[in-house]
C-alpha cells in the first residue's frame, strides 16, 4: 500500500521440538482490541486462519492446528503444543478494531541430533591408494535444523585438501521433518596414521545456544609395505638345553608379510629352511645344542613377490655334555684309598661338585674326589654335578656307586614284632655287603627277594603265626663269599595291657582284623647302624 510504513521484523520465538511455543500477540491497545483477534499461519506466503479470539474467548479453526492451540495470559498469548519441525513458520495476529493491524512472530524450531554414529572402514586403507579412500562414515540422526559436521584427526579438525582430504555430506528428511545427516571422510593416509584417532562432531543450535556432540574415537586399519624385517628370540638372555625357545620373525609392514626362517649349515655353508608354526614362529622345544647357529628371516610380499632379509642372529644353546666318572664302578677293600675323577664338556666354564648321594652333603668342590682309609660306611653313592654358574639350572650329574668288600651287614640285629595268633605275618629283613649277599629264613613260608641296589638286598617272608613260631621266633641269615650274619625277630602276642598309651614300642603292629593278611612291617626305616661290635 503506498505510503504504508515498512513492516517491522517479526519477533523471534525459539522452541525445541515437542515442547510448547508461546506466541504473544504484541499489538498495543492503540493498534487493536486483543479481545477480538484473528491468528494466521503463513506458509509459502499463503495465510491460513488458524484461531479466532472473540470477547476474550478462543476458537480453533479446523485444520492441522485444531488440537494444539489454546489461549493463555488473558487472551494475549496463543500456546502451540507438541511443536514439530513443520511448525517453523510465521504466525501473525490481527486486531479488528479500531483499525486492522497485525503483529508477526517467526517461530524457530530446534532439535538436538542423536549421538553421532561413526563407522570405520572395516577393510582398511592402503597408504599407496591413488586417490583419497573412504576412512569412516558419520551419521547424525533426527536433528533440526541440519547440524554441521566436523571431522577430527588426533584432536585437530580436518579441512578439505585437494587430493588429500575430501568430506562428502548429504542429508535426508525423515517423515517427522527431522534431518538425518550422513558424512563420509575420504583421505589419503600415511603409515603414521596407523595410530591416528578419528572422530566426527555434530554442531547444532538450541534455544539455549550452540552445542555439539562427538562420536567415539576410532582407529583405521592402515596397510603399508614392509621395509624392515628382524628376528626376536624368547626368552631373552642365556639359553640352555631343555628350554622352550621361540624364534619369531617380525616386520614393520601391515599386514605382516609371509615369513620363512632359515638356519645356516656350517658344513655346507647353505641356509636350510626351518619348519615354523602357523604364526611363522620357530619353536625349539626342548632346545638342544644342535640348534645353535646363525638364523635369518626372509619376508615375502605375496603381491609383489619382493623379499626382504633380516640381519642374521646367532643363537647359542648352552649345554653340559654327559658327565663321565672314572672309575665307573669302583670296588675297594676296607682301609684302602680311591680317587674319583669327573669330566664334562660345556659351551661355558664349568664348576664341579661331589656330593654324597644319601645325604646330599658336599664333599668336594672340583672335579677330583679323594677318599682315604675307606670304611664300610663309605660304600654307596657319590654324585658328581657339573654346572654352569652363570646359567641357573644348567647342570648334569653322574652317580657312581662305591662298593666296599665285606661280609653281610644287617639293617638290624634283633627286633620285637607284635602279632596275633593265626594271622599271616609279613616279615622283612635287609642286608648289605659286597659281593651282594643272599638271605635265607629258618622257617617255612613264602619268601621273595629284591635288590635295593647292587650291594643291598631286601627279603620278605609271609608266614602264619603258630604257637611254635611264637616260641622260637624267626631268624634271617645273610651270606656272601666273605661271611654270614643273622637277624632275629621275636614274636610277641598282643594283649590289651600291651597297648598302653605311653608305650614307646616302634615295631610294626597292625591292629587290623579285617584281613588275615595284615602286614606287620619289621623293616628298619632308619639307616642308623648299630656299633660294629654288635655285628656277628
Amino acid at each position: 500500500v503506498p505510503g504504508e510504513a515498512e513492516q517491522p521484523a517479526p519477533e523471534l520465538v525459539e522452541v525445541e521440538v515437542g515442547s510448547t511455543a508461546l506466541l504473544k500477540c504484541g499489538l498495543s491497545q492503540s493498534q487493536g482490541n486483543l479481545s477480538h483477534v484473528d491468528w494466521f499461519s503463513v506458509h509459502k506466503e499463503k495465510r491460513t486462519l488458524i484461531f479466532r479470539v472473540r470477547q476474550g474467548q478462543g476458537q480453533s479453526e479446523p485444520g492441522e492446528y485444531e488440537q494444539r492451540l489454546s489461549l493463555q495470559d488473558r487472551g494475549a498469548t496463543l500456546a502451540l503444543t507438541q511443536v514439530t519441525p513443520q511448525d517453523e513458520r510465521i504466525f501473525l495476529c490481527q486486531g479488528k478494531r479500531p483499525r486492522s493491524q497485525e503483529y508477526r512472530i517467526q517461530l524457530r524450531v530446534y532439535k538436538a541430533p542423536e549421538e553421532p554414529n561413526i563407522q570405520v572402514n572395516p577393510l582398511g586403507i592402503p597408504v599407496n591408494s591413488k586417490e583419497p579412500e573412504e576412512v569412516a562414515t558419520c551419521v547424525g540422526r533426527n536433528g533440526y535444523p541440519i547440524p554441521q559436521v566436523i571431522w577430527y584427526k588426533n584432536g585437530r579438525p580436518l579441512k578439505e585438501e585437494k587430493n588429500r582430504v575430501h568430506i562428502q555430506s548429504s542429508q535426508t528428511v525423515e517423515s517427522s521433518g527431522l534431518y538425518t545427516l550422513q558424512s563420509i571422510l575420504k583421505a589419503q593416509l600415511v603409515k603414521e596414521d596407523k595410530d591416528a584417532q578419528f572422530y566426527c562432531e555434530l554442531n547444532y543450535r538450541l534455544p539455549s545456544g550452540n552445542h555439539m556432540k562427538e562420536s567415539r574415537e576410532v582407529t583405521v586399519p592402515v596397510f603399508y609395505p614392509t621395509e624392515k624385517v628382524w628376528l626376536e628370540v624368547e626368552p631373552v638372555g642365556m639359553l640352555k638345553e631343555g628350554d622352550r625357545v621361540e624364534i619369531r620373525c617380525l616386520a614393520d609392514g601391515n599386514p605382516p608379510p609371509h615369513f620363512s626362517i632359515s638356519k645356516g649349515n656350517p658344513s655346507t655353508r647353505e641356509a636350510e629352511e626351518e619348519t615354523t608354526n602357523d604364526n611363522g614362529v620357530l619353536v625349539l622345544e626342548p632346545a638342544r645344542k644342535e640348534h645353535s647357529g646363525r638364523y635369518e628371516c626372509q619376508a615375502w610380499n605375496l603381491d609383489t613377490m619382493i623379499s626382504l632379509l633380516s640381519e642374521p642372529q646367532e643363537l647359542l644353546v648352552n649345554y653340559v655334555s654327559d658327565v663321565r666318572v672314572s672309575p665307573a664302578a669302583p670296588e675297594r677293600q676296607e682301609g684302602s684309598s680311591l680317587t674319583l675323577t669327573c669330566e664334562a664338556e660345556s659351551s661355558q666354564d664349568l664348576e664341579f661338585q661331589w656330593l654324597r648321594e644319601e645325604t646330599d652333603q658336599v664333599l668336594e668342590r672340583g672335579p677330583v674326589l679323594q677318599l682315604h682309609d675307606l670304611k664300610r660306611e663309605a660304600g654307596g653313592g657319590y654324585r658328581c654335578v657339573a654346572s654352569v654358574p652363570s646359567i641357573p639350572g644348567l647342570n648334569r650329574t653322574q652317580l657312581v656307586k662305591l662298593a666296599i668288600f665285606g661280609p653281610p651287614w644287617m639293617a638290624f640285629k634283633e627286633r620285637k614284632v607284635w602279632v596275633k595268633e593265626n594271622m599271616v605275618l609279613n616279615l622283612s629283613c635287609e642286608a648289605s655287603g659286597h659281593p651282594r649277599p643272599t638271605i635265607s629264613w629258618n622257617v617255612n613260608g613264602t619268601a621273595s627277594e629284591g635288590d635295593q641296589d647292587p650291594q643291598r638286598v631286601l627279603s620278605t617272608l609271609n608266614v602264619l603265626v603258630t604257637p611254635e613260631l611264637l616260641e622260637t621266633g624267626v631268624e634271617c641269615t645273610a651270606s656272601n663269599d666273605l661271611g654270614k650274619n643273622t637277624s632275629i625277630l621275636f614274636l610277641e602276642l598282643v594283649n590289651l595291657t600291651t597297648l598302653t598309651p605311653d608305650s614307646n614300642t616302634t615295631t610294626g603292629l597292625s591292629t587290623s582284623t579285617a584281613s588275615p593278611h595284615t602286614r606287620a612291617n619289621s623293616t628298619s626305616t632308619e639307616r642308623k647302624l648299630p656299633e660294629p661290635e654288635s655285628r656277628g
Partner: antibody, heavy 118, light 106 residues
Framework: QVTLKESGPVLVKPTETLTLTCTVS????????VSWVRQPPGKALEWIAA???????YYNSAFKSRLTISRDTSKSQVVLTMTNMDPVDTATYYC????????????WGQGTLVTVSS | DIQMTQSPSSLSASVGDRVTITCKAS??????LAWYQQKPGKAPKVLIF???SLQTGIPSRFSGSGSGTDFTLTISSLQPEDFATYYC????????FGQGTKLEIK
C-alpha cells in the same frame, strides 16, 4: 533404479579359473564400492572380495592367493577371477553394492550358481 | 577373524507372533551390524543397519537392538511374507555373516 547383474559360466571344471562379471546400473562405480559374496547350497553367506569407489582392492585372506578383482568404470563392470577351482567352491555368487554412507550392502544382484565338477 | 553366532538356527512361529533372533559377536563390534532377509532362490535384502537403523522401505515391525557383542532382530507381528532366512553381518573388521536363522510357519 539401482541394479546389479552377475554373469559367467554355470559350470567349471576342477583346477580351472572362474571369471565372473557384475554389470551395474543406476549408480557409478566411482561413488559406491562393490563386493562379491558367495553362498554354497544350503549354507551361509561368505564375503569374498571388494573393490572400493577409489579402486582399492580387498580380498578374504582365506582365498587371497586365488582371487583378483578389477573394474572397468566406463563399462560399469566389476570382474572377479578365481583360480584353481574346486568342487567346494560350488556356490551362488552374488555381487553387492556397498551403501555410500555405510559399510553394509544395500543392493544385491540376483546371483549366479556356479557348479564345479568334472 | 570375528565370528558371528546366530540363535536359534531355526524357528517355527505363526502369523501375528512376536519373534526374536539373536546374534553374538566373538568380540566387541560396537554397533557395526546389519540384518538381512533372504528368501529361497533370492538375493539377501538389508533390513537393519548400524544395529538399530531401519533401512528405507522396510516395514516398522522390524527392529534391531544391541551393541558390543549381543544383538537382536525383532519382528513385532509376523506377516506371511516374513517367513525366510535371516542373517546378521558384522562390518567392524572385515565382513562376516552369521550362519543364518530359518523362520518357518508353525
Amino acid at each position: 533404479q539401482v541394479t546389479l547383474k552377475e554373469s559367467g559360466p554355470v559350470l567349471v571344471k576342477p583346477t580351472e579359473t572362474l571369471t565372473l562379471t557384475c554389470t551395474v546400473s543406476g549408480f557409478s562405480l566411482t561413488s559406491n564400492g562393490v563386493s562379491w559374496v558367495r553362498q554354497p547350497p544350503g549354507k551361509a553367506l561368505e564375503w569374498i572380495a571388494a573393490i572400493s569407489s577409489g579402486g582399492t582392492t580387498y580380498y578374504n585372506s582365506a582365498f587371497k592367493s586365488r582371487l583378483t578383482i578389477s573394474r572397468d568404470t566406463s563399462k560399469s563392470q566389476v570382474v572377479l577371477t578365481m583360480t584353481n577351482m574346486d568342487p567346494v567352491d560350488t556356490a551362488t555368487y552374488y555381487c553387492a553394492r556397498r551403501y555410500g554412507y555405510g559399510w553394509y550392502f544395500d543392493f544385491w544382484g540376483q546371483g549366479t550358481l556356479v557348479t564345479v565338477s568334472s | 577373524d570375528i565370528q558371528m553366532t546366530q540363535s536359534p538356527s531355526s524357528l517355527s512361529a505363526s502369523v501375528g507372533d512376536r519373534v526374536t533372533i539373536t546374534c553374538k559377536a566373538s568380540q566387541n563390534i560396537y554397533n557395526s551390524l546389519a540384518w538381512y532377509q533372504q528368501k529361497p532362490g533370492k538375493a539377501p535384502k538389508v533390513l537393519i543397519f548400524n544395529a538399530n537403523s531401519l533401512q528405507t522401505g522396510i516395514p516398522s515391525r522390524f527392529s534391531g537392538s544391541g551393541s558390543g557383542t549381543d544383538f537382536t532382530l525383532t519382528i513385532s507381528s509376523l506377516q506371511p511374507e516374513d517367513f525366510a532366512t535371516y542373517y546378521c553381518q558384522q562390518f567392524y573388521s572385515g565382513y562376516t555373516f552369521g550362519q543364518g536363522t530359518k523362520l518357518e510357519i508353525k
